[in-house]
């Protein structure tokens, strides 16, 4: 299953964690994919490491853990944020944060 | 059903750069990243790099961090693996391998190319 | 980084035999390792993925088991075709790191 905060809010100009936590008894973690609405923003796995898309690699950076750190926030990256846990054999878990960009 | 055909083996001499290249034959790269391995004479296998076409992002092995560039071109489906400063130790068999990405990250490197022979030599 | 250690690092055995390979990780990794059968002038083969996976087109003479440190690649009745190097990889912690081979040779 995937465990996260659905809604999380943060000020213009600064910083948020996205987390999503992802336990299973059986499935291995073989790819984290992070989406904004349908953009991929970044994507991890042990085969490849972090790569982050060029569009966002000077205000994103992974972790910590599996999560993500948005940084120089603007009113435009409110919106709705996906993290998807490709797993082996478990298949895939998706988790939605939805993400409020505020004036500060 | 993809190949990966690298091409030709290079003679260089110590100091100097070598451009490997890697194309995939009868497919895209928009699902896959492609790693570089190398192996020197009589030796065993040694991760080098990875690039993740769709971004456009590489990372590297330690040992060769400063040294090694991969780069792909998403529009010919390429990638290339180029090694500068290069010694006698160098010398090797150099490999691409296609990795998955998203629902088949699990497999690994399930399709390699040919490789291509690098020697070093003054 | 993780180091992957192999035994034994050559062996001899007769078409037949059945041949046993083991891989050992420096830390747990689950069962995030892979199997790989090099011949001579040639490029890897992709057998095994996660520990026990056979990859599609291998022969199920070839089988892979163990979780955590302790791996093995089992050739349950060796043929001539089999003949060649094997090498494990874990793919637990970036950057992956492979073994450093077992060659299997005619007895």
């Known amino acids: 299953t995937i465990d996260t905060k659905r809604n999380i809010s943060a000020e213009e100009g600064g910083s948020v964690i996205l987390q999503c936590h992802f336990s299973s008894d059986t499935a291995e973690v073989t790819q984290v994919d992070w989406k904004q609405q349908d953009q991929l923003l970044a994507i991890y796995s042990v085969d490849l490491g972090w790569h982050v898309a060029s569009v966002f690699s000077d205000r994103v950076v992974p972790g910590p853990s599996l999560g993500l750190t948005f940084q120089s926030l603007t009113m435009n990256d409110t919106g709705e944020y996906f993290c998807t846990y490709h797993t082996y054999p478990g298949g895939i878990y998706k988790g939605r944060i939805f993400l409020k960009v505020q004036e500060s | 059903q993809v190949q990966l055909v690298q091409s030709g083996a290079e003679v260089k001499k110590p100091g100097s750069s070598v451009k490997v290249s890697c194309k995939a034959s009868?497919?895209?790269?928009?699902?896959?990243?492609i790693s570089w391995v190398r192996q020197a004479p009589g030796q065993g296998l040694e991760w080098m790099g990875v690039?993740?076409?769709?971004?456009?992002?590489?990372n590297y092995a330690q040992k060769f961090q400063g040294r090694v560039t991969v780069t792909a071109d998403e529009s010919t489906s390429t990638a290339y693996m180029e090694l500068s400063s290069l010694r006698s130790e160098d010398t090797a068999v150099y490999y691409c391998?296609?990795?998955?990405?998203?629902?088949?990250?699990?497999?690994?490197?399930?399709?390699w190319g040919q490789g291509t022979t690098v020697t070093v030599s003054s | 980084d993780i180091q992957m250690t192999q035994s034994p690092s050559s062996l001899s055995a007769s078409v037949g035999d059945r041949v046993t390979i083991t891989c050992r990780a420096s830390?747990?990794?689950?069962?995030?390792l892979n199997w790989y059968q090099q011949k001579p002038g040639k490029a890897p083969k992709l057998l095994i993925y996660?520990?026990?996976s056979l990859q599609s087109g291998v022969p199920s003479r070839f089988s892979g088991s163990g979780s955590g440190t302790d791996f093995t690649l089992t050739i349950s009745s060796l043929q001539p075709e089999d003949f060649a190097t094997y090498y494990c990889q874990q793919r637990y912690v970036f950057p992956p790191t492979f073994g450093g081979g077992t060659k299997v040779e005619i007895k």
């Open positions: 996660a520990a026990s």
């Open positions: 690039i993740v076409p769709i971004f456009g992002t590489a």
């Open positions: 009868g497919g895209t790269f928009q699902n896959y990243a």
């Open positions: 391998a296609r990795l998955h990405l998203g629902q088949k990250a699990y497999y690994g490197m399930d399709v």
């Open positions: 830390q747990s990794i689950s069962s995030y």
